[in-house]
Structure formats: structure tokens, C-alpha cells
Amino acid sequence: AYGPGETLCGGELVDTLQFVCSDRGFYFSRPSSRANRRSRGIVEECCFRSCDLALLETYCATPAKSE
């Protein structure tokens, strides 16, 4: 189970993103960011530090449809 303050790296990070974002797909760095390729991104935020579900969702490719 995914809990707050947990670090996610490697395969666990990819698998969790696939689950959270489902068919929306995801980015490893936010497309809005023009920063140097990997100076910031989900690896830094979730593996090098810890992140939560809300932050994970910000890396999904398109917003979830509201019902």
C-alpha cells in the first residue's frame, strides 16, 4: 500500500504511476517545466525524497475526467 512519507524508486515508482494515472499516461518531468531535463522531476521528488498521492497525480499526462 502507498502511504505518506514513503519513497518510491525504480520499478515501484513506475508501477505506482501506472496505477495512479491509469490510461492517462504520465511524465517524469512536468511538461510545463522548461528546466534542464532532470534538474527536477518525479525521481527527485519521490525517490530522492518522499512524496504523496497528490504529488504523484501532478505527473499524470491529462487531468482525470470529472463525473
Epitope: 519513497t7 518510491l8 524508486c9 525504480g10 520499478g11 515501484e12 515508482l13 513506475v14 508501477d15 517524469f28 534542464n36 531535463r37 532532470r38 534538474s39 527536477r40 525521481v43 527527485e44 525517490c47 530522492f48
Partner: antibody, heavy 121, light 107 residues
């Protein structure tokens, strides 16, 4: 072609520190994560940590937390690994290894030639 | 930490043989497994990643399979240059951990 060239062999006394360098060439230095892996004589491989050469952020294996520091110099495309409070069990070949994956998966497609660090009184 | 156990620790084989090496993870790691080849005095070489994907430039006689906790590396038609030590590594979570190695020796 991609090349990772490490610094030369070192002999250190227990309690001392060692700093190993790894100079990268043949690719965009800031576009690939770099890891450090060590191998004691006749033994298996042990992961030490990872550095993002772009931003300089790091993540270390718990075992080395507090003793290891990984840094980089983008002007020379070089990463460094410093290990302090050396003990005899730290005698090993230290490798830098490039990660082929954007997700820092630990898929090491290019390795340095290795630096032998010997800790002996 | 995830423990990786390889078997056998060594295997004797002849040129042309088929060699099978097994790697077991102490917990499920999906398909997040890597295989390396290492020759004496040299750095490891990436063979297979994501359990079954062949790294560019690696001969097709090498193949990997498995998921969850059990993985296999197969070397078909063993060549003289294949005599080496092979390591598995999990890339599911940190710390990244390696198996103890399997030495493929000449019979």
C-alpha cells in the same frame, strides 16, 4: 562513444577518507543519472547510491548514509564519490555506472574501469 | 531490503551447450530484473533489463524471462567468450540489490 574514466588506485589508513572521480565523455553529462557500485575482492556487487548530474541531488543506500558524499562538477563532466571513516571492509573496487533509464531504474549501460581502494594500517 | 539469490553458484559447460541460470527475489519485483556479465578484472556488462529486454549489441543467444520472484537467464549455443560470472539485480526499489553471482566455467 560513451566513456567513464575513473581516478587511480588509492591506499588509505583506517579512519581516513577517499575521494574517487569519474569523468564522463561522449554524451550529454546532465541527461543521465549516475550510480556508484562497489565490489570487494572476490565478492559480489553492492549499490552505494545515485546522483543526478543535472541538479546535483543524491540518494544513498542506508548502509552508507552519513559516510558517503556524491557530488558533481558540470564544467568538467565529472562525478565524485567520497567515503569517510574508512575501515578494512571498505577495501573494494569502486565503479561509477551510468543509468540508461530516464526513471533512474538502475539499468547500468556504461561503467567506469573501476578504482581499487585498499584500506590497510 | 530485497534479497536476490542465484543458483547455481557455478556451472561447468562446454562450447555449444545451453546454460540456464536462476535468480530468486525475496519478494515480488514484477519484471524489474537486470542481468549482467562480468569477466575477471573488468566492469560488469549489461545484458538484459526489465527481465527480458536485450540490451543493444548483446547477442541474441542470451535471453531472459520471468516475473514476480523467479527469473531465468538462458545462454544458447555457449561461446568461448561467454565464460564469465553472471549477476542478477533487482531494479524494483532502493537499495538496488544484486545476486551473489553464477560463474560459468569451461568443462
Amino acid at each position: 562513444q560513451v566513456q567513464l574514466v575513473e581516478s587511480g588506485a588509492e591506499v588509505k589508513k583506517p579512519g581516513a577518507s577517499v575521494k574517487v572521480s569519474c569523468k564522463a565523455s561522449g554524451y550529454t553529462f546532465t541527461s543521465y543519472y549516475m550510480h556508484w557500485v562497489r565490489q570487494a575482492p572476490g565478492q559480489g556487487l553492492e549499490w552505494m547510491g545515485i546522483i543526478n548530474p543535472s541538479g546535483g541531488s543524491t540518494s544513498y543506500a542506508q548502509k552508507f548514509q552519513g559516510r558517503v558524499t556524491m557530488t558533481r562538477d558540470t564544467s568538467t563532466s565529472t562525478v565524485y564519490m567520497e567515503l569517510s571513516s574508512l575501515r578494512s571492509e571498505d577495501t573494494a573496487v569502486y565503479y561509477c555506472a551510468r543509468d540508461r533509464s530516464i526513471a533512474a531504474m538502475g539499468w547500468f549501460d556504461h561503467w567506469g574501469q573501476g578504482t581499487l581502494v585498499t584500506v590497510s594500517s | 531490503d530485497i534479497q536476490m539469490t542465484q543458483s547455481p553458484s557455478s556451472v561447468s559447460a562446454s562450447v555449444g551447450d545451453r546454460v540456464t541460470i536462476t535468480c530468486r527475489a525475496s519478494q515480488g519485483i514484477s519484471s524489474w530484473l537486470v542481468w549482467y556479465q562480468q569477466k575477471p578484472g573488468k566492469a560488469p556488462k549489461l545484458l538484459i533489463y526489465a527481465a527480458s529486454r536485450l540490451q543493444s549489441g548483446v547477442p541474441s543467444r542470451f535471453s531472459g524471462s520471468g516475473s514476480g520472484t523467479l527469473f531465468t537467464l538462458i545462454i544458447n549455443n555457449l561461446q568461448p567468450e561467454d565464460f564469465a560470472t553472471y549477476y542478477c539485480q533487482q531494479s524494483n526499489s532502493v537499495p538496488l540489490t544484486f545476486g551473489g553471482g553464477t560463474k560459468v566455467e569451461i568443462k
